[in-house]
Interface confidence: low
């Protein structure tokens, strides 16, 4: 059977969802007036950078858009960005596309995404509404790094 990405609604413990604003992702409160993105997730077939303790290596994309999450250094700081890329193009590559890879780890009923390119840096939402989704190395009260993934048919 041909591989296909799994689709998820994603939210954090404060009921913030991910919203596409232009070509960037922001966190916004779950409400009828907001259209949250559906996250596409597919496992990487290449095991070059695998680390089972950190989780499964996955590519993350936005359903219905040729946009994928990737990590790059800007002014010396790891930064989360969206790049025009079809998630299946990443999947079919024999060699793992490191900037686009994340370790997906389960913590209880939540999911955590750690950059493969920048170990110790996690996808996070701010506790303030309307802020971009970003990478942080400080997990805790001021940043939400644990997400609920609700499967979408």
């Amino acid at each position: 059977r041909e591989a296909a990405p799994k689709s998820y609604a994603i939210r954090d413990s404060r009921q913030m969802v991910w919203v596409l604003s232009g070509n960037s992702l922001i966190a916004a409160p779950l409400s009828r007036s907001i259209k949250p993105v559906t996250l596409h997730l597919i496992a990487c077939r290449d095991t070059e950078f695998s680390d089972k303790e950190k989780g499964n290596m996955v590519y993350l994309g936005i359903k219905g858009k040729d946009l994928c999450l990737f990590c790059a250094e800007i002014q010396g700081k790891p930064t989360l960005q969206l790049k025009e890329k079809n998630i299946m193009d990443l999947y079919v590559e024999k060699k793992a596309q490191k900037p686009f890879l994340f370790f997906h780890n389960k913590e209880g009923s939540t999911s955590v995404f750690q950059s493969v390119s920048y170990p110790g840096w996690f996808i996070a939402t701010s506790t303030t509404s309307g802020q971009p989704i970003f990478l942080t190395k400080e997990r805790g009260i001021t940043n939400n790094t644990n997400f609920y993934l609700d499967s979408v048919e």
């Epitope: 609604a9 413990s13 404060r14 009921q15 913030m16 916004a28 409160p29 779950l30 409400s31 009828r32 007036s33 907001i34 949250p36 009923s109 939540t110 506790t127 509404s129 609920y148 609700d150």
Partner: antibody, heavy 122, light 111 residues
């Protein structure tokens, strides 16, 4: 039609643990896109949300009660329960269980139990 | 003290229109969280009256309507009837508290 029924002791001694169960009929507690909650109302006062558990098993608690509250689901009995530890007279209230739907956003608690009065007294 | 502020009481004569306000802040209503309204008749459990700011569940008369603007929400009742005499509560989500919050409730008296 979904129906909820609270059950548990009507009298609890101070410092003990209040335990209530909500039995769900007319639907499955494991159904996708539902969340289940507990709300209380002290005599003559307003409503206070205690906490909720959603269809993923994720729990959410009122920050002022968090250290004392546990909400859990028993799928085999189609029930969810509330445990509130170290109770005082201030926990005397009518306790309601309620449910609502989640579809991109929360749609309010649209089904409620009839409520059960719990008195904390020695 | 409730996170959402409602007037303790409102009143109106049969046939009149009354409104009940619910004032929040930038961490709940003002942060685009939905507002829900409940009606609690004496001695009974609350009943969902309005969900998602302005939507009526089936069976709720169109005399009841909800609206939201900025950090506040309102419930309007037109053609007031004796059976509308009840307590009314607004509810939203507050991200600074990571949970649901209710207003203190408003007692509606039909004169």
């Amino acid at each position: 039609e979904l129906q909820l029924q609270e059950s548990g002791p009507g009298l609890v001694k101070p410092s003990e643990t209040l335990s209530l169960t909500c039995t769900v009929s007319g639907g499955s507690i494991t159904a996708s896109n539902y969340y289940w909650g507990w709300i209380r109302q002290p005599p003559g006062k307003g409503l206070e949300w205690i906490g909720s558990i959603d269809y993923t098993g994720s729990t959410y608690y009122n920050t002022s009660l968090k250290s004392r509250v546990t909400i859990s689901v028993d799928t085999s009995k189609n029930q969810f329960s509330l445990k509130l530890s170290s109770v005082t007279a201030a926990d005397t209230a009518v306790y309601y269980c309620a449910t609502g739907k989640y579809y991109e956003t929360y749609l309010g608690f649209d089904v409620w139990g009839q409520g059960t009065l719990v008195t904390v007294s020695s | 003290e409730s996170v959402l502020t409602q007037p303790p009481s409102v009143s109106g004569a049969p046939g009149q229109r009354v409104t009940i306000s619910c004032t929040g802040s930038s961490s709940n209503i003002g942060a685009h969280y939905d507002v829900h309204w409940y009606q609690q008749l004496p001695g009974t459990a609350p009943k969902l009256l309005i969900y998602g700011n302005d939507n009526r569940p089936s069976g709720v008369p169109d005399r009841f309507s909800g609206s939201k603007s900025g950090t506040s929400a309102s419930l309007a009742i037109t053609g007031l009837q004796a059976e509308d005499e009840a307590d009314y509560y607004c509810q939203s989500y507050d991200y600074s508290l990571s949970g649901y919050v209710f207003g203190g409730g408003t007692k509606l008296t039909v004169l």
